[in-house]
Interface confidence: medium
């Protein structure tokens, strides 16, 4: 079971999945950088079926998406949450 904590504590991902999620199933991705109470980099994926998944930041597929988003954001105005 994948868990995301929503508490006064700042780290939200207990477990992370490296399982590929097709882009058509992804609603949005939130990247929480290290710091601000959680020393861990966390990537949280909101799926279109309303489920929430913490993704292993080292997973190759999410790194490819992140790289694509970085390239996209460098050519367009930045948005707060992808």
């Amino acid at each position: 079971v994948l868990e995301v904590y929503y508490t006064h504590l700042r780290c939200r991902c207990v477990q992370e999945s490296s399982v590929f999620i097709p882009r058509r199933f992804i609603d949005r991705i939130q990247i929480s950088p290290r710091g601000n109470g959680c020393p861990r980099k966390e990537i949280i994926v909101w799926k279109k079926n309303k489920s929430v998944v913490c993704v292993d930041p080292q997973a190759e597929w999410i790194q490819r998406i992140m790289e694509m988003l970085r390239k996209k954001s460098s050519s367009t105005p930045p948005v707060p949450v992808f």
Epitope: R10, V14, S17, S18, R40
Partner: antibody, heavy 119, light 107 residues
Framework: EVQLLESGGGLVQPGGSLRLSCAAS????????MSWVRQAPGKGLEWVSA????????YYADSVKGRFTISRDNSKNTLYLQMNSLRAEDTAVYYC????????????WGQGTLVTVSS | DTQMTQSPSTLSASVGDRVTITCRAS??????LAWYQQKPGKAPKLLIY???SLASGVPSRFSGSGSGTEFTLTISSLQPDDFATYYC?????????FGGGTKLEIK
């Protein structure tokens, strides 16, 4: 009751290798971030490494990066620390710790295992 | 890396005393600070996290305060069981770092 039991410590020569194990019980191991913290004789505490519940994310202190590897086997409820290229300054008691949920703080500690690096 | 500095390194006190230990961070860490107690030959024990939140089972005579770069651990009335070494630790960012420790000894 949360229990963490380290093993695998001992005397090793400089440049040698050692693998520490930590057997966990009393909680859902696969849902817990785990860490290793060490303490040289008569000295203070030093954080060594941390690993996520799934094992996908790992972090290391600069002093051990490239030499130590943290891993886990959730089917065996066991945490590991593979230590290579050991140096005299790695001599310490190594503690296995379980983080509190959602916070990078060691809420539970094992009793420790002593690693001595000496020729 | 965030450096943590504790003072004093040694503190002599008597049973019933009120004692305060200080921990300073080299950069702002908000309130992401924990305190541990360690007795000789034993593993450390978590006392306080988030600067002032008491860990489960910790007596109320222990309290923590502070934010940013300066933090304190206070023991309102020392008990014989409290003579130990105390460490602060920041968890704002990896690498997690500890203070050098404060040894609380009997006067």
């Amino acid at each position: 009751e949360v229990q963490l039991l380290e093993s695998g410590g001992g005397l090793v020569q400089p440049g040698g290798s050692l693998r520490l194990s930590c057997a966990a019980s009393g909680f859902t191991f696969g849902n817990s971030w785990m860490s290793w913290v060490r303490q040289a004789p008569g000295k203070g505490l030093e954080w060594v490494s941390a690993i996520s519940g799934s094992g996908g994310s790992t972090y290391y202190a600069d002093s051990v990066k490239g030499r130590f590897t943290i891993s886990r086997d959730n089917s065996k409820n066991t945490l590991y620390l593979q230590m290579n290229s050991l140096r005299a300054e790695d001599t310490a008691v190594y503690y296995c710790t379980r983080d509190l949920p959602g916070i990078a703080v060691a809420g539970y500690w094992g009793q420790g295992t002593l690693v001595t690096v000496s020729s | 890396d965030t450096q943590m500095t504790q003072s004093p390194s040694t503190l002599s006190a008597s049973v019933g005393d009120r004692v305060t230990i200080t921990c300073r961070a080299s950069e702002g860490i908000y309130h992401w600070l924990a305190w541990y107690q360690q007795k000789p030959g034993k593993a450390p024990k978590l006392l306080i996290y988030k600067a002032s939140s008491l860990a489960s089972g910790v007596p109320s005579r222990f309290s923590g305060s502070g934010s940013g770069t300066e933090f304190t651990l206070t023991i309102s009335s020392l008990q014989p069981d409290d003579f130990a070494t105390y460490y602060c630790q920041q968890y704002s960012n990896y690498p997690l770092t500890f203070g050098g420790g404060t040894k609380l000894e009997i006067k």
